[in-house]
């Protein structure tokens, strides 16, 4: 007899886009409308919750812009939280200082992406230093991952 | 009897590099020579044509440079076109303003990468705002994807 | 009789982080402690050594910063070396010029990532133009790959 048909497992993947009603850290994300993906991973209060241990490629882009450049330091972090550990773990980070000409309208992006070994119940978040300078267009600011 | 040997499916993947004879939008790409990859995906008039629905990681980098900075706004977009939809969909975008010191020689890159659910017959393209400021070296300006 | 249980092959993956005792090129990497991954790939004198031919997504981020900007040109390269070829092949490269205000404290990142067809015994390295301007925090400067 032929072997039973292979059960095609759903790919664990997420692509969340900017949500302009973020008021504090971590950033909140659009998880329903537009070019969003969420499969085999949960979204909870700004975080992607891993439900299967394994290797994941995690990425994020944040689009910063302003009208009168003051060169406030910008930071963009992807970090991990797990109830087993007392402290957040910064997985990836980008920083910018002295990036525009004083007083000018300016715009700049930060991109992060890398592979991590994640454990079931890990919560992943994105943090930025200057929330008021983030533009949340879905094509410009996003956060995602997929299981290798 | 043992099951038939598994037919290893060709990975759907593309990595195209800058082509300096691009004269208008969308950008055109080198699809034959150098460190180019094109397998299970077609290249047509600047676009990558999807022939199998599924999840894809899509990425692009563009290298902008100039002899005398005048801070023209720069944009770098990856967008999708499908005959079923009336309008292009911007999947990812990077913008830069006030990024160099007036009059100086300057150079800057924009990188984009994320996961999308693509449908057979989707065409993916890259657009930039200032074609004359793009350098097309194969290591500096590229466009690619792979099916997860 | 049922077919033998599938032998789950170990995923070929690496994520190496910045090592501040890099003294010359190529950059050296932390391959043991922290959020490091190294499986099915070898690390040797700054390089990731491929032991199985195939398609790989390769990425790197470098975090440059300085106390007093003088706009030294910055470059960040991922290149490949193989004893069969006389010359290094630059796979990906980022360059920056005129990126900060003279005399100011500054910080900037360069990110690279793309798919390549690599061959067993290929050695992959990262090179930067100004080693003294690199910050080696594990979340800020890294180098990795995974087999598709």
């Amino acid at each position: 007899p032929s072997p039973p048909p292979e059960k095609k497992e759903l790919r664990k993947v997420a692509h969340l886009t900017g949500k302009s009603n973020s008021r504090s850290m971590p950033l909140e994300w659009e998880d329903t409308y537009g070019i969003v993906l969420l499969s085999g991973v949960k979204y909870k209060k700004g975080g992607l919750v891993i439900n299967e241990t394994g290797l994941y490629f995690v990425y994020s882009k944040v689009y910063f812009r302003g009208q009168s450049c003051n060169n406030l330091p910008l930071s963009h972090k992807v970090y991990m939280r797990n109830s087993k550990y007392p402290q957040d773990l910064v997985m990836m980070e980008g920083k910018m200082m002295s990036y525009c000409t004083t007083g000018q309208m300016w715009a700049r992006s930060s991109y992060l992406g890398a592979v991590f070994n994640l454990t079931s119940a890990d919560h992943l978040y994105v943090n930025v230093s200057e929330l008021s300078l983030v533009n949340f267009e879905e094509s410009q600011t996003f956060f995602g991952l997929y299981k290798l | 009897p043992s099951p038939p040997p598994e037919k290893k499916e060709l990975r759907k993947v593309a990595h195209l590099t800058g082509k300096s004879n691009s004269r208008s939008m969308p950008l055109e790409w080198e699809d034959t020579y150098g460190i180019v990859l094109l397998s299970g995906v077609k290249y047509k008039k600047g676009g990558l044509v999807i022939n199998e629905t599924g999840l894809y990681f899509v990425y692009s980098k563009v290298y902008f440079r100039g002899q005398s900075c005048n801070n023209l706004p720069l944009s770098h977009k990856v967008y999708m076109r499908n005959s079923k939809y009336p309008q292009d969909l911007v999947m990812m975008e990077g913008k830069m303003m006030s990024y160099c010191t007036t009059g100086q020689m300057w150079a800057r890159s924009s990188y984009l990468g994320a996961v999308f659910n693509l449908t057979s017959a989707d065409h993916l393209y890259v657009n930039v705002s200032e074609l004359s400021l793009v350098n097309f070296e194969e290591s500096q300006t590229f466009f690619g994807l792979y099916k997860l | 009789p049922s077919p033998p249980p599938e032998k789950k092959e170990l995923r070929k993956v690496a994520h190496l982080t910045g090592k501040s005792n890099s003294r010359s090129m190529p950059l050296e990497w932390e391959d043991t402690y922290g959020i490091v991954l190294l499986s099915g790939v070898k690390y040797k004198k700054g390089g990731l050594v491929i032991n199985e031919t195939g398609l790989y997504f390769v990425y790197s981020k470098v975090y440059f910063r300085g106390q007093s900007c003088n706009n030294l040109p910055l470059s960040h390269k991922v290149y490949m070396r193989n004893s069969k070829y006389p010359q290094d092949l630059v796979m990906m490269e980022g360059k920056m010029m005129s990126y900060c205000t003279t005399g100011q404290m500054w910080a900037r990142s360069s990110y690279l990532g793309a798919v390549f067809n690599l061959t067993s015994a290929d050695h992959l390295y990262v090179n930067v133009s100004e080693l003294s301007l690199v910050n080696f925090e594990e979340s800020q400067t890294f180098f990795g790959l995974y087999k598709l």
């Epitope: 302003g66 009208q67 009168s68 450049c69 003051n70 060169n71 406030l72 002295s98 004083t102 007083g103 000018q104 309208m105 008021s132 300078l133 | 706004p73 913008k95 | 205000t101 100011q104």
Partner: antibody, heavy 119, light 111 residues
Amino acid sequence: QVQLVQSGAEVKKPGASVKVSCKASGYTFTDYTIHWVRQAPGQGLEWMGVISTYQGDASYNQKFKGRVTMTVDTSTSTVYMELSSLRSEDTAVYYCARFPDWDYAMDYWGQGTLVTVSS
Amino acid sequence: EIVMTQSPATLSVSPGERATLSCKASQSVDYDGDSYMNWYQQKPGQPPRLLIYAASNLESGIPARFSGSGSGTEFTLTISSLQSEDFAVYYCQQSRELPYTFGQGTKLEIK
């Protein structure tokens, strides 16, 4: 509440310099650039330049290049605008105004400082 | 630099009536879906006061009788029903690029 308080009126001779101060309170000083705008008697508004309160460097209107210097003292949340080689046509009210980087316009202004240049 | 031209120089209107002030820019002040045009009101002996930002957005605390419109190079400030406290000088200003530039002003006076 947000306040920008400028120094008092000045009378200067042609060729001299004047230094006007603008002290900020009621908000996080280093989060906003400070712009300087002047207004000659019975005339319109003229933008002079802007200073980064965080970084301390400035961008100036080309018209005043070489004559205007803007500085910042973060310890006292004060910005200074110095104009040198004064001439009679520099007689004006000088205003400082803050500009939120995330917004579109100068939202709070100082009360103005009248500088009179006369021999 | 971008030159801003306001018209008319003086506008005489009766209280309760509608006032329409115009501002033209020598080049577009639009970028990325926004118009970088602001309107200020100035009364004698006082600093300018922000009324409208980004062409059509009412600054907090400004009465709803003030409205702005336009894009590209042509902009309008409208006061729907003039109150006695509205008689002042009005300036348009572009914040699209440095140097910021102002119009020469429109004086709104009681008819």
